[in-house]
Interface confidence: low
């Protein structure tokens, strides 16, 4: 028998620096977790105790702190050189500054190979980008071969700016040829390495013929066998066993997101390339794992062009604005409700005696929302802080909407309802009841809007045939998170002001905040 | 095609008051969102910016010059009137009109006009 | 209001070369800053937006970054029809713009 130890990695976001507990700016060092230094230390700690080590990245190390914004992606090549990664995948995310966004400086930079084999390029990008990323690789490991084979998730044209020259297959049509093909150089140990979400994983796992393992990301999915170790609830245990449609047991896993574990997979194969047992678990990278100090010093050095983003303090939150994926993506959460009102507030236009404003709504991705921020920094707010909470770069903008659409659109907010999916929306100006125990398209109860026409806004019924204006993100108003309605039923669009100058300025001219959770969007069964 | 062009005398006396018009097509000021600035050069000097006006008829100042400035527009003649009153020989400038993007920006902007100010 | 300090006023710069433009803001604009490019005789012309966002047809040699009160613009290899005046105006606030800086052949 030979035995495999998988060290993987998902989701990182841009976490270089170790965070606090929930993936937020470290405040209190003795109980920050993750980081690039932390991670090292113990990725060197088992490379030094076991022989036969492969370190993954299933994708998704671009985009969510001020590190991204200012280095583009420099630093997620230099970091993962330096932590010697073996491989990695791409994620929807890597496309986020377009395909040269990627090619420049992380495809031309890696030491590693970068993989996905459902992403085809076409027209003048095929010859640009031919070879600096591959469909699988073949790494020795000790005397052994195993085969890493990739994919990204083919909704990354929804979710991301890879342009038209990349096609984006079905993960599971593309992985096939690729797995026989590493099968015919006789490769019998084959990773799938990709980020398409645990469903897709599982999938994989039962219906590509060949793969032994497969190493996942997107859905931050958080495995455990036993007691967890921090906040954290498993999805199921580590490692999660599907059995697949030709009867062999198939290990998949993933290791949560934002550097906060590192996945720890022992695979044990036969002479055959079998898996004979799996086991493992992620480790929590907290305080009790020392920070490598060359990469700590490392990143200090680095860390030096960022400090001009984080000295600016913009306002004072004397509450938790609570932007976790776990309050934001299922219920009203804080942070949502202190976006929308920074939305509505940058449009005040005071311009009729007849309407206290020409727009009085807001709708949210809470997908969009992708960080908390601690009060208990002194309440300090600064640029750093709304840049890992809103780091994509957007706008806030204007559309005009026919009532049906925006009841489409709620609707398209819970259709999947608990799944952590990025769809649901965060409201301003909008209560919304959701009776989830009817079937999907049918769950919108309730949709009162405030009046606009009107001196003392109040909430009435939203009207189906009527116009509204709404402000949200471009992003949705493009379509994005499955929005296709609000893209195609617009009737009119204007650009806005880019979404973190919207809330900065808000906490800046509000100078003290304090958002609360306050019944905008409610759950019911049966008669509300 | 967004295009802009300013009009206006080429000459004025000190104490007199200027009226520029600003006549844009390619666009339309009743649309949301959608704002007119003007800005002025004077000869081998910086630009400063000195009003502008949104569809929804918000008018907006630059403050050391706020009480010489008027900014107006007609929506259905595709037009913004700027007028400045008691000229002076240090207003002698090219004045253009442009197009509001986003903020304040300008992404659209007329050739400009050369106004003289002097006796 | 919000004073817009660019340096140098002037430069002199050989075709092919790379050159760096910068601007300081009196106070923090976050990254609401934009830059002009504009040639004897002729309006304005808008390069970069939100401090580092090209605007539509600008060529890819010109790229914006910064953020608070410092803002450099960089044009990677100089081509002959970039020699012209370069403004940056901040819109934070009511727009000001820069003194701008002469880009001349050496």
């Known amino acids: 028998a030979w035995e495999l130890t998988i060290l993987h990695t998902n989701d990182v976001h841009s976490r270089l620096e170790q965070t606090s507990e929930d993936s937020s700016k470290c405040v209190n060092a003795s109980r920050c977790m993750g980081g690039v230094a932390r991670l090292f230390t113990k990725v060197q700690q088992i490379r030094r105790a076991e022989p036969n080590v492969l370190l993954l990245d299933a994708g998704d190390q671009y985009q969510g702190t001020i590190w991204f914004t200012v280095y583009k992606g420099a630093e997620v090549a230099h970091f993962m050189n330096a932590l010697r990664y073996d491989a990695m995948a791409l994620g929807n995310h890597e496309f986020d500054n377009g395909v040269e966004g990627l090619i420049e400086p992380l495809l031309k930079e890696a030491k590693f190979p970068i993989l996905s084999a459902n992403i085809k390029a076409k027209g003048p990008l095929a010859s640009q980008i031919s070879g600096l990323y591959l469909p699988y690789k073949v790494l020795p490991v000790g005397d052994e071969v195993v085969g890493i084979v990739g994919y990204t998730s083919k909704e990354t044209p929804f979710l991301s700016n890879p342009g038209t020259n990349l096609v984006f297959e079905d993960e599971i049509t593309a992985l096939q040829p690729e797995v026989d093909k590493l099968k015919t150089l006789n490769v019998n140990k084959i990773i799938a390495l990709g980020h398409s979400g645990f469903e897709m994983d599982k999938l994989i796992a039962q219906k590509v013929r060949g793969v032994d393992v497969v190493v996942g990301g997107h859905s931050n999915t958080f495995l455990y066998t036993g007691n967890p170790p921090s906040k954290e609830v498993p999805a199921g245990k580590y490692p999660f066993i599907v059995t697949s449609d030709d009867g062999r047991k198939v290990p998949v896993v993933q290791a949560y997101a934002f550097g906060k574990y590192l996945g720890y997979l022992k695979i044990e194969f036969d002479e055959r390339g079998n898996v004979i047992s799996s086991h493992g678990n992620p480790i929590l990278l907290n305080s009790s794992i020392p920070e490598d100090p060359s990469i700590k010093a490392d990143i200090n050095k680095w860390r030096i062009k960022l400090d001009n983003y984080s000295t600016q303090e913009l306002g004072k939150t004397i509450v938790y604005l609570d932007g976790s994926s776990q309050s934001c993506r299922f219920r009203e959460c804080n942070m949502g409700n202190l976006i929308c009102d920074a939305m509505i507030n940058n449009n005040l236009r005071h311009t009729d005696e007849m309407f206290w404003n020409h727009v009085s709504m807001c709708i949210l991705n809470g997908g969009g929302i992708r960080s908390p921020i601690d009060e208990r920094n002194n309440g300090t707010i600064t640029w750093e802080n709304l840049a890992a909470v809103l780091p994509f770069g957007g706008t806030f903008d204007l559309v005009q909407l026919k009532g049906s659409t925006l009841k489409k659109a709620f609707e398209h907010s819970v259709h999947r309802y608990g799944q952590s999916t990025g769809e649901f929306l965060q409201v301003g100006g909008i209560h919304v009841v959701y009776d989830l125990s009817r079937k999907p398209g049918d769950r919108v109860v309730k949709l009162d809007v405030l009046c606009t026409k009107c001196r003392v806004p109040s909430y009435d019924p939203l009207k189906m045939d009527e116009v509204y204006k709404v402000i949200l993100p471009n992003f949705l108003a493009n379509g994005g998170d499955g929005f296709q309605m609000i893209k195609d039923e617009l009737l009119r669009h204007d650009s806005g002001d880019q979404d973190i100058n919207v809330v900065s300025t808000y906490i800046s001219k509000m100078k003290v905040i304090y958002p609360a959770v306050e019944g905008r969007i409610k759950f019911s069964t049966g008669s509300h | 095609q967004v295009t802009l062009r300013e009009s206006g005398p080429a000459l004025v006396k000190p104490t007199q008051t200027l009226t520029l018009t600003c006549t844009f097509s390619g666009f339309s000021l009743s649309t949301s969102g959608m704002g007119v600035g003007w800005i002025r050069q004077p000869p081998g000097k910086a630009l400063e910016w000195l009003a502008h006006i949104w569809w929804d008829d918000d008018k907006y100042y630059n403050p050391s010059l706020k009480t010489r400035l008027t900014i107006s527009k007609d929506t259905s003649r595709n037009q913004v009137v700027l007028t400045m009153t008691n000229m002076d020989p240090v207003d002698t400038a090219t004045y253009y009109c442009?197009?509001?993007?986003?903020?304040?920006?300008?992404?659209?902007w007329g050739q400009g006009t050369l106004v003289t100010v002097s006796s | 209001d919000i004073q817009m300090t660019q340096s140098p006023s002037s430069l002199s710069a050989s075709v092919g070369d790379r050159v760096t433009i910068t601007c300081r803001a009196s106070?923090?604009?976050?990254?609401?800053v934009a830059w002009y490019q504009q040639k004897p005789g002729k309006a304005p012309k808008v390069l970069i937006y939100s401090a580092s966002y090209r605007y539509s047809g600008v060529p890819s040699r010109f790229s914006g970054s910064g953020s608070g009160t410092d803002f450099t613009l960089t044009i990677s290899s100089l081509q002959p029809e970039d020699f012209a005046t370069y403004f940056c105006?901040?819109?934070?606030?009511?727009?000001?713009f820069g003194q701008g800086t002469k880009l001349e052949i050496k």
């Open positions: 106070q923090n604009v976050f990254t609401n």
């Open positions: 442009a197009r509001r993007e986003r903020w304040a920006w300008f992404a659209y």
């Open positions: 105006q901040q819109y934070n606030s009511y727009p000001t």
